[in-house]
């Protein structure tokens, strides 16, 4: 912490401007009024204060707002956000998506920090659900965001928000998460025609039950092997050889390369050899 020293003559800050970057830490502490700082926060991010100087500015804001910063200050934190701890952020009430975007921008290009995770958590809880605009914003900054949520948290995602989800946003989701997201996606895309529906639902199919896979097999969807390998084993096992052949279309030949891997391995073991032989791939049940 910076020790209290008197401000040198003529150095008292009248406004937040570039001249302050030449102030040492103790001079900032002594010469910048916290109330002035709070009212001119929009200027702070336009001035290239160093990390050490930001320590002092944060200290001033903490003294002024011990119960947590108002949103008018939060939205202009800029690089000062990097100085905030999760404990600081838990005191905030962030309601504006623009504020959220401004703070995520500061952390852009970096992995999700505990500070960002806390900020998002506060924001989403404040909204009550993960609406489409919020999800759009979060997945734009953090493609893996959706898969970082628990199944319980995912249950608050309304089906309408699923339109914002891109295939890469689901890359790290596990089956439990896809179990929650798939029914929402099915509902969201229900009015689309066959081929368009399959394009949209494809990345969610890791949560699909057997009956839906059977239905898809009747629609000439030509599912690729990568998607097939992500299906739930318990959903694949009841499928007949004919249904898998229809589901995969020309990609059925790829089963041979995957015969030792789940779910293909387990599915093969459930089939009659006569049925497997109809594929002409040399699969051994």
């Amino acid at each position: 912490e910076v020790e209290k020293t008197a401000c040198p003559s003529g150095k008292k800050a009248r406004e937040i401007d570039e001249s302050l970057i030449f102030y040492k830490k103790w001079e900032l502490e002594a010469c910048v009024d916290a109330a002035l700082l709070a009212t001119q926060m929009d200027r702070v991010n336009a001035i290239p204060f160093t990390y050490e100087q930001l320590d002092v500015l944060k200290h001033k804001l903490d003294e002024l707002y011990p119960q947590g910063y108002p949103e008018s200050v939060i939205q202009h934190l800029g690089y000062l956000f990097l100085k905030m701890s999760p404990e600081d952020i838990r005191k905030w009430n962030v309601t504006s998506l623009e504020t959220l975007k401004a703070l995520l921008e500061v952390n852009k290009g970096h992995e999700m920090s505990p500070q960002v995770a806390t900020l998002i958590d506060r924001f989403v809880k404040g909204r009550g659900q993960l609406d489409k605009d919020t999800l759009d914003t979060l997945t734009a900054f953090y493609p893996g965001y959706l898969c970082s949520l628990s199944p319980e948290e995912l249950s608050s995602v309304p089906p309408s928000s699923i339109w914002a989800v891109r295939p890469q946003d689901l890359d790290t989701c596990d089956p439990r998460q896809l179990d929650v997201l798939y029914p929402k996606a099915r509902l969201a895309f229900q009015n689309m025609n066959g081929s368009e529906y399959f394009v949209k639902i494809q990345s969610f199919l890791g949560g699909a039950p057997t009956e839906d896979l059977k239905a898809l097999s009747q629609q000439n969807v030509s599912m690729d092997l990568a998607t097939f390998m992500k299906l739930r084993t318990d959903a694949v096992l009841p499928l007949t050889v004919a249904e898998v052949q229809k589901l995969l279309g020309p990609h059925v030949e790829g089963l041979k390369a995957e015969e030792r891997h789940r779910p293909v391995r387990d599915w093969i073991l459930r089939q009659r050899q006569d049925d497997l032989d109809t594929l002409g791939l040399g699969l051994q049940g």
Epitope: P48, T50, E52
Partner: antibody, heavy 120, light 107 residues
Framework: QVQLVQSGAEVKKPGASVKVSCKAS????????MHWVRQAPGQGLEWMGM????????IYYEKFQGRVTMTVDKSISTAYMELSRLRSDDTAVYYC?????????????WGQGTLVTVSS | DIVMTQSPDSLAVSLGERATINCKAS??????VAWYQQKPGQSPKLLIY???TRHTGVPDRFTGSGSGTDFTLTISSLQAEDVAVYFC?????????FGAGTKLEIK
């Protein structure tokens, strides 16, 4: 990859001005402050100031205030540093450099340097 | 302004031996210190920042340490390509200031 390519060596007389250019490529020119640092022969490095290409906002080190002018031409991603009323002790290699994270002002990328010789 | 005093001015070390360069700040700068390497006829290259974090691609024989006012750059096993001038820089506050440099040669 990030590249900062500077103009060639200059020889100037005392009292004259010199204008050094720095052409940037490999990154979004308007995203980062452009800094200027000089190095007198056999000496250490001396920071002169910076300019933000997006806002034209300049911050000069007090020592050079009134003699230095930093400008940019966004259309050709080029920064300029003009030093006026040259003295013999301004003889130095002048570098442009960028800092990726403003709050951590370490110099991430440097130009190759421009030697300015001030001699009568 | 914060003055960075580097020592020694020059240093001769045998190949494979340890080289140590010191830098003292006139005020407490926390860990806001960077180290640069400058080979003859070249511009400086960033080696270390935050006093001890190696920049991308910098060999692990280069180590930085220190905080407050005293900082050290150590090259654990000198290689021929390490012959250069080394500078420290503080970025605690502006103006950004550098040490005068330490010339490292092979003994």
């Amino acid at each position: 990859q990030v590249q900062l390519v500077q103009s060639g060596a200059e020889v100037k007389k005392p009292g004259a001005s010199v204008k050094v250019s720095c052409k940037a490529s490999g990154y979004t020119f308007t995203s980062y402050y452009m800094h200027w640092v000089r190095q007198a022969p056999g000496q250490g490095l001396e920071w002169m100031g910076m300019i933000h290409p997006n806002s034209d906002n300049t911050i000069y080190y007090e020592k050079f205030q009134g003699r230095v002018t930093m400008t940019v031409d966004k259309s050709i991603s080029t920064a300029y540093m003009e030093l006026s009323r040259l003295r013999s002790d301004d003889t130095a290699v002048y570098y442009c450099a960028i800092i990726i994270t403003p709050v951590v002002p370490k110099f991430d990328y440097w130009g190759q340097g421009t030697l300015v010789t001030v001699s009568s | 302004d914060i003055v960075m005093t580097q020592s020694p001015d020059s240093l001769a070390v045998s190949l494979g031996e340890r080289a140590t360069i010191n830098c003292k700040a006139s005020h407490d700068v926390g860990t806001s210190v960077a180290w640069y390497q400058q080979k003859p006829g070249q511009s400086p290259k960033l080696l270390i920042y935050w006093a001890s974090t190696r920049h991308t691609g910098v060999p692990d024989r280069f180590t930085g340490s220190g905080s407050g006012t005293d900082f050290t750059l150590t090259i654990s096993s000198l290689q021929a390509e390490d012959v250069a001038v080394y500078f420290c820089q503080q970025y605690s506050s502006y103006p950004l200031t550098f040490g005068a440099g330490t010339k490292l040669e092979i003994k």
